[in-house]
Interface confidence: low
C-alpha cells in the first residue's frame, strides 16, 4: 500500500487552530521516479457533505512530501469529508477523513467501519440531542432508510447492512428529520473486496494474518498497519510518537500523537494514534490496553508489563506477543518482514534461529508460497545463533508471496512468514527525447515510460555514431535530470538508447528502442572578457572570465585559455571543456614568469574572438640560485661545470637542473638533472667540437629555484659531431685531481 497518512488535529475548541496534514512517506516522493509524478493533493470534498461557503482554505506545502490545510474560521467549516491524494500512476491513492460536529444531534459511535465482503455491517448513531422525529439514513448522499424515533435501542439508532458488497462502501449519514445536515452523524464504510482473511483476484489468496489491528489489503495482500506499527504483519511497534510505514514520521508538538486522528489508505480507514483513544483521541489507554484506539489487550504473561504504545514488554527469558514463549523454544531471529528480488535472479536468503537445544542446519527450512520446501546449503553456527543460508532457484513471478522460515527442535518450533516481492526489471517502451543539440554535444531527456517495475535506480544512455560497429559508449545518469552527451563529433548522427535498472542484483532491464540524434555546429561569435585572476601558488593561477548576455542558447563547446611566455617565446594552451565554466585553475606554470593571458570560446574546431589580453607576473619560488657557476672545456666533446651550493637554503636540495643551449642557436634548450645534490661539479659529455655553449643551472627542493648566472664555454676543436650532450658528475675535488 502507498505510504500516505492524513492527520487531523482535533483541537475542536478553536476551529482556527484546526489543521489537516497529508504526509507521504513514499520513497522519492517528489524526487527520483516520482519527480515528474503528480503532487500531493489535499482538499475538502463537497460532493456528498455540502457545507455553507466560507473563505477559501489555505494550502501550504512543506517540500514535496507534506501538505497542510488551514484557515477554518467556524466549526461548520470542519464538518464533512476531506481527502488526500498521493502516489503516482497505478499507485495513486486517496485517503479520506470524515469529520463530525461534536455538537451534532446524532454522533457516530465509530466513524470508520472496515468490514469484509459478505459481512453484516452495523452503523450506530448515538443520540446526543434528542428529537422526536424520524431518523433518515443516507448512503453517499442518497436516501437509504428511515427509522422511527421509537426504534432507538439503548439511545442508539442502528443501521444493519447485511451481506455487504464493495459497492456498499462510502459515506453514510444519520440525520433527524428537519434537522440541519451539519447535525448528522457521518460514517465511512469500507468493504474489502474479499471475505475475511482472503485477498487477490477471486479472493483465492490467504492474508498474512495482520497483527495489532492491521487490515489485509484485498488487492495486494499487504497489511495496512495502524499508526505506530510496522512490518509485513504489523508485528513491530514504532517508538512512541512515530508513524508511517517505516516509523519514519514524527507526530508534531510536545504531546506526541495526542489529539490526532490518523487516516490511512483503504481498507484501514481512520483511528487514533497508538496509545490514544476517544472521539478526540485525547484519552490515554486504560491499563492493560494498547495500540491505535486502545483496541488491543496486552494480557502479558510471565511478568511482562503492558506498554500502551507497544504492548507487552517481556522480562529476560521470555518473548512473544504476550511473553508467552520461553526463550528455550526455538526462535527465528531478525527475519526481515519483506524482501525484494528481481526476476530470474538466484538470491541467497538467510534465516537465523536460536534456542535450546541449539538449532542445527537440518532443523531450519524455507517454504515457498507454492509449498516447495528448500533445505539450507550451508549454516554458520555462532555462540548465540545458527544462520542457515538458502540458495533459491531462479525466481519466477509466481514466487511472489509469503515465504516462511521454520525452525524445529525438540524444544518446540517457530516460524516466521515474510513477504517476497519478485520484481520485473524495467524495459523502456520508448526512445529518449532529444532536447537540444550542439556541435559536440546532445542534450537528451532519458525519461521514458517503461514496462516492468520501478523504482528506477539507474538510467544508462548508450550511444554511438550511426552505422558504426564500434563499441557503444555508456553514461550513467540521474533519471530526474536531462543528460548531456559530450565530446561528440560535430554534424554526426548518433544512435541513442536507454537502459533502465531497478535496485538489487539482476535489476538491469533490456535496452529500449534506438533513436537517431545528430550533432550541430554553428560558429562561436561571443567575445569573452577576463574578469580577474589571482595567484594561488608560485606555479598556480586562478582565472575567471565572463561572456556577454545574449538571448538564446550559448553557441560553444568550451573555452581555450592561452598563456604567452614572452621571455622564452613559449605558448601554453588550456582547454576548458564546459561552456558553462567561468573559472579555471592553471597549474604547472613557471614561477617568476611574466605571462600574457587571453581566453576565447570554441565550438567544434572553430575559435571565437579572443578576449582583450591581460598581463600576469607569477612570483619566483624555490631555493636561491647556485653560486659561482664556472665552465671549463676538457676536450672537443666535454665541458666541466663547477659551482658552489646556494646560501640560506629552506631545506635539503633534491637535485640540480642544468640548462644547455648552443649559443645563438634557435632550438629549444636541453635540461639535464644532476641527481646527487651533494655534487658541486659535473661533466657535460657528447658535445659538438668547436662549438660555443651557454650554461645555467638551478637547484630544486620542493619546487625549482632561481636560475644561476649564465656562463659560456666552447669545446676544443677537431672533434667529430657528437650525438648530444650527457653529463657525468663527481665531487669537485675529484674532478680537479684528475
Amino acid at each position: 500500500a502507498v505510504d500516505l497518512t492524513l492527520l487531523a488535529n482535533l483541537r475542536l475548541t478553536d476551529p482556527q487552530r484546526f489543521f489537516l496534514t497529508c504526509v507521504s512517506g513514499e520513497a522519492g516522493a517528489g524526487r527520483g521516479s516520482d519527480a515528474w509524478g503528480p503532487p500531493l493533493l489535499l482538499e475538502k470534498d463537497d460532493r456528498i457533505v455540502r457545507t455553507p461557503p466560507g473563505p477559501p482554505l489555505r494550502l501550504a506545502r512543506n517540500g514535496s512530501h507534506q501538505v497542510t490545510l488551514r484557515g477554518f474560521s467556524k466549526p461548520s467549516d470542519l464538518v464533512g469529508v476531506f481527502s488526500c491524494v498521493g502516489g503516482a500512476g497505478a499507485r495513486r491513492t486517496r485517503v479520506i477523513y470524515v469529520h463530525n460536529s461534536p455538537g451534532a444531534h446524532l454522533l457516530p459511535d465509530k466513524v470508520t467501519h472496515t468490514v469484509n465482503k459478505g459481512d453484516t455491517a452495523v452503523l450506530s448513531a448515538r443520540v446526543h440531542k434528542e428529537k422526536q422525529t424520524d431518523v433518515i439514513w443516507k448512503s453517499n448522499g442518497s436516501y437509504f432508510y428511515t427509522l422511527d424515533w421509537h426504534e432507538a435501542q439503548d439511545g442508539r439508532f442502528l443501521l444493519q447492512l447485511p451481506n455487504v458488497q464493495p459497492p456498499s462502501s462510502g459515506i453514510y449519514s444519520a440525520t433527524y428529520l428537519e434537522a440541519s445536515p451539519l447535525g448528522s452523524a457521518f460514517f465511512r464504510l469500507i468493504v474489502r473486496g474479499c471475505g475475511a482473511g482472503r485477498w487477490g483476484p477471486g479472493c483465492t489468496k490467504e492474508c498474512p494474518g495482520c497483527l495489532h489491528g492491521g487490515v489485509c489489503h484485498d488487492h495486494d495482500g499487504e497489511c495496512v498497519c495502524p499508526p505506530g506499527f510496522t512490518g509485513t504483519r504489523c508485528e513491530q511497534a514504532c517508538r512512541e510518537g512515530r508513524f508511517g510505514q517505516s516509523c519514519q514520521e514524527q507526530c508534531p508538538g510536545i504531546s506526541g500523537c495526542r489529539g490526532l486522528t490518523f487516516c490511512l489508505p483503504d481498507p484501514y480507514g481512520c483511528s487514533c494514534g497508538s496509545g490514544w483513544r476517544g472521539s478526540q483521541c485525547q484519552e490515554a489507554c486504560a491499563p492493560g490496553h494498547f495500540g491505535a484506539d486502545c483496541r488491543l489487550q496486552c494480557q502479558c504473561q510471565n511478568g511482562g508489563t503492558c506498554d500502551r504504545f507497544s504492548g507487552c514488554v517481556c522480562p529476560s527469558g521470555w518473548h512473544g506477543v504476550h511473553c508467552e514463549k520461553s526463550d528455550r523454544i526455538p526462535q527465528i531471529l531478525n527475519m526481515a518482514s519483506e524482501l525484494e528480488f528481481n526476476l530470474e535472479t538466484m538470491p541467497r536468503i538467510n534465516c537465523a534461529a536460536a534456542g535450546n537445544p541449539f538449532p542445527v542446519r537440518g532443523s531450519i527450512e524455507l517454504r515457498k508460497p507454492d509449498g516447495t520446501v528448500l533445505l539450507s546449503t550451508k549454516a554458520i553456527v555462532e555462540p548465540e545463533k545458527t544462520t542457515a543460508e538458502f540458495e533459491v532457484p531462479r525466481l519466477v513471478l509466481a514466487d511472489s508471496g509469503f515465504w516462511e522460515c521454520r525452525v524445529s527442535t525438540s524444544g518446540g518450533q517457530d516460524s516466521r512468514r515474510f513477504k517476497v516481492n519478485v520484481k520485473v526489471p524495467p524495459v523502456p517502451l520508448a526512445a529518449p527525447r532529444l532536447l537540444t543539440k550542439q556541435s559536440r554535444q546532445l542534450v537528451v531527456s532519458p525519461l521514458v515510460s517503461f514496462s516492468g517495475d520501478g523504482p528506477i535506480s539507474t538510467v544508462r544512455l548508450h550511444y554511438r555514431p550511426q552505422d558504426s560497429t564500434m563499441d557503444w559508449s555508456t553514461i550513467v545518469v540521474d533519471p530526474s535530470e536531462n543528460v548531456t552527451l559530450m565530446n561528440l563529433r560535430p554534424k554526426t548522427g548518433y544512435s541513442v538508447r536507454v537502459q533502465l535498472s531497478r535496485p538489487g542484483e539482476g535489476g538491469e532491464g533490456a535496452w529500449g528502442p534506438p533513436t537517431l540524434m545528430t550533432t550541430d555546429c554553428p560558429e562561436p561569435l561571443l567575445q569573452p572578457w577576463l574578469e580577474g585572476w589571482h595567484v594561488e601558488g608560485t606555479d598556480r593561477l586562478r582565472v575567471s572570465w565572463s561572456l556577454p548576455l545574449v538571448p538564446g542558447p550559448l553557441v560553444g563547446d568550451g573555452f581555450l585559455l592561452r598563456l604567452w611566455d614572452g621571455t622564452r617565446g613559449q605558448e601554453r594552451r588550456e582547454n576548458v571543456s564546459s561552456p558553462q565554466a567561468r573559472t579555471a585553475l592553471l597549474t604547472g606554470l613557471t614561477p617568476g614568469t611574466h605571462y600574457q593571458l587571453d581566453v576565447q570560446l570554441y565550438h567544434c574546431t572553430l575559435l571565437g574572438p579572443a578576449s582583450p589580453p591581460a598581463h600576469v607576473l607569477l612570483p619566483p619560488s624555490g631555493p636561491p640560485a647556485p653560486r659561482h657557476l664556472h665552465a671549463q672545456a676538457l676536450s672537443d666533446s666535454e665541458i666541466q661545470l663547477t659551482w658552489k651550493h646556494p646560501e640560506a637554503l629552506p631545506g635539503p636540495i633534491s637535485k640540480y637542473v642544468v640548462e644547455v643551449q648552443v649559443a645563438g642557436g634557435a632550438g629549444d634548450p636541453l635540461w639535464i638533472d644532476v641527481d646527487r645534490p651533494e655534487e658541486t661539479s659535473t661533466i657535460i659529455r657528447g658535445l659538438n667540437a668547436s662549438t660555443r655553449y651557454l650554461f645555467r643551472m638551478r637547484a630544486s627542493i620542493q619546487g625549482l629555484g632561481d636560475w644561476s648566472n649564465t656562463v659560456e664555454e666552447s669545446t676544443l676543436g677537431n672533434g667529430l659531431q657528437a650525438e648530444g650532450p650527457v653529463q657525468e658528475s663527481r665531487a669537485a675535488e675529484e674532478g680537479l685531481d684528475q
Epitope: 459511535d109 465509530k110 467501519h113 469484509n116 459481512d119 453484516t120 452495523v122 450506530s124 426504534e151 442508539r156 442502528l158 444493519q160 447485511p162 451481506n163 471475505g195 475475511a196 482473511g197 494474518g209 483513544r277 490496553h289 484506539d293 486502545c294 483496541r295 489487550q297
Partner: antibody
Framework: EVQLLESGGGLVQPGGSLRLSCAAS????????MIWVRQAPGKGLEWVSR????????EYADSVKGRFTISRDNSKNTLYLQMNSLRAEDTAVYYC??????????????????WGQGTMVTVSS | DIQMTQSPGTLSLSPGERATLSCRAS???????LAWYQQKPGQAPRLLIY???SRATGIPDRFSGSGSGTDFTLTITRLEPEDFAVYFC??????????FGGGTKVEIK
C-alpha cells in the same frame, strides 16, 4: 417484554418434514438478524442457520444445507425453519435466537442475547 | 473451518472457589468476536460475555472474559451455587459464520 417463542416440534419419521415457527415480541423484529441453533440430547450447541433482517440473505450449516430452509415474515414478526428429508441425527431441541450488536472500544460485537425456550424435534421410525 | 475446543470437559469445584475455563480456536477469531454462554438443565442458553471480555447486561462482575486470537478464557472468581452449569464459547464471523465449543460442565465437588 422481549421474548421469542418456538413451536412446531414433534415426532416425525426419517425422510419426513416439519416446519418450526418462532414468534417474536417486544422488539422491532424486522431490524434484527435471527438464527436457529439446535442441541442434540446430552450434547453441545450447533448453529443451524441464520437470516438477515430483510430476509434476503441466508446461510446454513453444512449438515443441513439443501434440506432446511430458513425464512421470516417481518409483518408477522415470525421466523420459520422448514425441515425436509429429516434424519435421525436431526433429533434435537431447536432454539431461535436474536443477534444483537454490542458496541465497545474494539467495534461491534454480535451476540445472541435473546433465546426462545426451545422446541423438541424427534426423528424416529 | 474454525473449530472451537473447550477444556476441561468437566470441572469439579466447591462454592467460593475460582473457575478457569479455556476455549481454543483452530484459527484466529476475527476481531475477537467471541461470546460465552451459560446453560442450565432444561433451559435455553444465557449470554454472559461478548467481544471476548465485555459482560452482558445484568451479569455479575465475578464473571470475566479475556484472550484474543486463538486462546480465550472465562473466569468465575468465586463460584456461587447458581453458577454450576454448562458453559459454551462461540465464535462469530468466521467460516462457518457461527461455531460453538463442545462445552465445559462446572459441577459441585
Amino acid at each position: 417484554e422481549v421474548q421469542l417463542l418456538e413451536s412446531g416440534g414433534g415426532l416425525v419419521q426419517p425422510g419426513g418434514s416439519l416446519r418450526l415457527s418462532c414468534a417474536a415480541s417486544g422488539f422491532t423484529f424486522s431490524s434484527y438478524l435471527m438464527i436457529w441453533v439446535r442441541q442434540a440430547p446430552g450434547k453441545g450447541l450447533e448453529w443451524v442457520s441464520r437470516i438477515y433482517p430483510s430476509g434476503g440473505g441466508t446461510e446454513y450449516a453444512d449438515s443441513v444445507k439443501g434440506r432446511f430452509t430458513i425464512s421470516r415474515d417481518n409483518s408477522k414478526n415470525t421466523l420459520y425453519l422448514q425441515m425436509n428429508s429429516l434424519r435421525a441425527e436431526d433429533t434435537a431441541v431447536y432454539y431461535c435466537a436474536r443477534v444483537t450488536y454490542y458496541y465497545d472500544s474494539s467495534g461491534y460485537q454480535p451476540a445472541f442475547d435473546i433465546w426462545g425456550q426451545g422446541t423438541m424435534v424427534t426423528v424416529s421410525s | 473451518d474454525i473449530q472451537m475446543t473447550q477444556s476441561p470437559g468437566t470441572l469439579s469445584l466447591s462454592p467460593g472457589e475460582r473457575a478457569t475455563l479455556s476455549c481454543r480456536a483452530s484459527q484466529s477469531v476475527s476481531g475477537n468476536l467471541l461470546a460465552w454462554y451459560q446453560q442450565k438443565p432444561g433451559q435455553a442458553p444465557r449470554l454472559l460475555i461478548y467481544g471476548a471480555s465485555s459482560r452482558a447486561t445484568g451479569i455479575p462482575d465475578r464473571f470475566s472474559g479475556s484472550g484474543s486470537g486463538t486462546d480465550f478464557t472465562l473466569t468465575i472468581t468465586r463460584l456461587e451455587p447458581e453458577d454450576f452449569a454448562v458453559y459454551f464459547c462461540q465464535q462469530y464471523g468466521g467460516s462457518p459464520p457461527v461455531t460453538f465449543g463442545g462445552g465445559t460442565k462446572v459441577e459441585i465437588k
